[in-house]
């Protein structure tokens, strides 16, 4: 009689993560009597996957009833496959022994490969905001995919970027892999509404790549431009001075009026107008009672934007053209929240 052979007909099996793997094994004979065990890997460090005789293997089911006397089909199913299950599985026939059963014959092994989808790409930008014309770095990370082959692309507003570096780890064999990419992006003043997109393509995604995005609104700081102008005289002794704060982002802005270097009023930008490019404009005005001044007045609009050092713009107000009348009321008319009386 021919000696028992253990046949594993499949050299390799490819399974998607989350699915069930079927590992086939048959014996050519019932004898010698003894159980079958399944192992992952070979040698002393092999991992027991299924023992017909004893133990609890909740993810493993047998294809046929191994308690039947004449059974020679020792195929198993492993449920809810993860990348960690990848490896070579051996169906091993034991013969009855004492005190322990003795390994008799092993199948040739079946290599289980697991296809696992990459996680959704996570794009992160710099910790601090940067201004236009500066180059900033964005990183993109995705994890847990298998096999190792993967494609990553960067886009800014639909235009593919070329200045990036990508690494897939680990370099050697692994149950699953991670990708890390860093792209360099030059900011422009128009980038408040811009998006940077990291796109990952993998065999498990069936041509439908995963995307991660970062809004440049989280990254860019557009400093304001200031313009101080003197409006036509509103009343006989009053001058309206405006400070136009234009094209800034983000909105966080504090404005201080100085008269001859002394703080006159501080306010925070509230009712701003938004430009098409996402930047903001704001205007503050000051009503100056020139009759309260003997000399010329230097008015300064000082703006602190997004915690940055203040920028300012000054305007010299000539008072010689408005001689002060004796005994006149020096109190300016208070007609609005942005008006300021000068004494």
């Amino acid at each position: 009689e021919e000696e028992l052979q253990v046949i594993q007909p499949d050299k390799s099996v490819l399974v998607a993560a989350g699915e069930t793997a079927t590992l086939r094994c048959t014996a050519t004979s019932l004898i010698p009597v003894g159980p079958i065990q399944w192992f992952r890997g070979a040698g002393p460090g092999r991992e027991l996957i299924y023992n017909q005789k004893e133990g609890h293997f909740p993810r493993v089911t047998t294809v046929s009833d191994l308690t039947k006397r004449n059974n020679m089909d020792f195929s198993i199913r492993i449920g809810n496959i993860t990348p960690a299950d990848a490896g070579t599985y051996y169906c091993v026939k034991f013969r009855k022994g004492s005190p322990d059963d003795v390994e008799f014959k092993s199948g040739a092994g079946t290599e289980l490969s697991v296809r696992a989808k990459p996680s959704a790409p996570v794009v992160s930008g710099p910790a601090a905001r940067a201004t236009p014309q500066h180059t900033v770095s964005f990183t993109c990370e995705s994890h847990g995919f298998s096999p190792r082959d993967i494609t990553l692309k960067w886009f800014k507003n639909g235009n593919e970027l070329s200045d990036f570096q990508t690494n897939v780890d680990p370099v050697g064999e692994s149950v699953s892999y991670s990708i890390h990419s860093t792209a360099k992006v030059v900011l422009t003043r128009e980038d408040v509404h811009s998006q940077v997109i990291c796109e990952v393509a993998h065999v498990t995604l069936q041509g439908d790549p995963l995307r991660g995005t970062a809004n440049l609104s989280e990254t860019i700081r557009v400093p304001p431009t200031l313009e101080v102008t003197q409006q036509p005289v509103r009343a006989e002794n009053q001058v309206n001075v405006t400070c136009q704060v234009r094209k800034f982002y983000p909105q966080r802005l504090q404005l201080t009026w100085l008269e001859n270097g002394n703080v006159s009023r501080t306010e925070t930008a509230s009712t701003v107008t938004e430009n098409k490019d996402g930047t903001y404009n704001w205007m503050s005005w000051l009503l100056v009672n020139v009759s309260a001044h003997r000399d010329d007045v230097k008015l300064t609009c000082q703006v602190e934007h997004d915690g940055q050092p203040a920028v300012s713009k000054s305007h010299d107000l000539k008072v010689s053209a408005h001689p002060k009348e004796q005994g006149s009321n020096t109190a300016a008319e208070n007609t609005g929240s942005n008006e300021r009386n000068i004494y």
Partner: antibody, heavy 120, light 107 residues
Framework: QVQLVQSGAEVKKPGASVKVSCKAS????????ISWVRQAPGQGLEWMGW????????NYAQKLQGRVTMTTDTSTSTAYMELRSLRSDDTAVYYC?????????????WGRGTLVTVSS | DIQMTQSPSSVSASVGDRVTITCRAS??????LAWYQQKPGKAPKLLIY???NLQSGVPSRFSGSGSGTDFTLTISSLQPEDFATYYC?????????FGGGTKVEIK
């Protein structure tokens, strides 16, 4: 046909030894184990031990350890059980049985039994 | 050692009756339990193996169930040739042990 044929009845004096044979036919002898089970008159079944016909490995019941020896001869497909230092309470029918479970032990084929009487 | 406790030790029944015999193991033995029938002067005969599998050639009125520690042998409709003694046996580990037996007698 598939069968186990045991040797005939024996009458022994206390302190003597007995060797019972069990000849297998109709199946591949070395592919299975053989257990020996005895039954005293009017009593239940008592497992004595097991031998692998493939390797000769054995496992004996604790109470018989040192007095029992099980062997096989694959050339003649025969299993043997020798019990030494016989006592009167060893009087029993001795059965050989083929062990057929793959990952457990059960006996699907039995010999007809050999009556061993120990009497002075 | 694993102790096997069979109950009842004897049962009187009539032809056509349903007979149930139970066997309890002192510790878990998975499904590794066998049932035997023995008639006077004869060798035991395997009826059920691995708790619930009917041995080839055994009538289907015999059935087995259970796992772990509690097991049952059922004869659905007792026939005249079924009057005998029945033994359970654990085959999970050495030493192999038998139950004390249940004698099924004619009422």
């Amino acid at each position: 046909q598939v069968q186990l044929v045991q040797s005939g009845a024996e009458v022994k004096k206390p302190g003597a030894s007995v060797k019972v044979s069990c000849k297998a036919s109709g199946y591949t002898f070395h592919g299975y184990g053989i257990s020996w089970v005895r039954q005293a008159p009017g009593q239940g079944l008592e497992w004595m031990g097991w031998i692998s016909a493939y390797s000769g490995e054995t496992n004996y019941a604790q109470k018989l350890q040192g007095r029992v020896t099980m062997t096989t001869d694959t050339s003649t497909s025969t299993a043997y059980m020798e019990l030494r230092s016989l006592r009167s309470d060893d009087t029993a029918v001795y059965y050989c049985a083929r062990e057929a479970g793959s990952s457990w032990y059960d006996f699907d084929l039995w010999g007809r039994g050999t009556l061993v009487t120990v009497s002075s | 050692d694993i102790q096997m406790t069979q109950s009842p030790s004897s049962v009187s029944a009539s032809v056509g009756d349903r007979v149930t015999i139970t066997c309890r193991a002192s510790q878990g033995i998975s499904s590794w339990l066998a049932w035997y029938q023995q008639k006077p002067g004869k060798a035991p005969k395997l009826l059920i193996y691995a708790a619930s599998n009917l041995q080839s050639g055994v009538p289907s009125r015999f059935s087995g169930s259970g796992s772990g520690t509690d097991f049952t042998l059922t004869i659905s409709s007792l026939q005249p040739e079924d009057f005998a003694t029945y033994y359970c046996q654990q085959g999970a580990s050495f030493p192999i042990t038998f139950g004390g037996g249940t004698k099924v007698e004619i009422k």
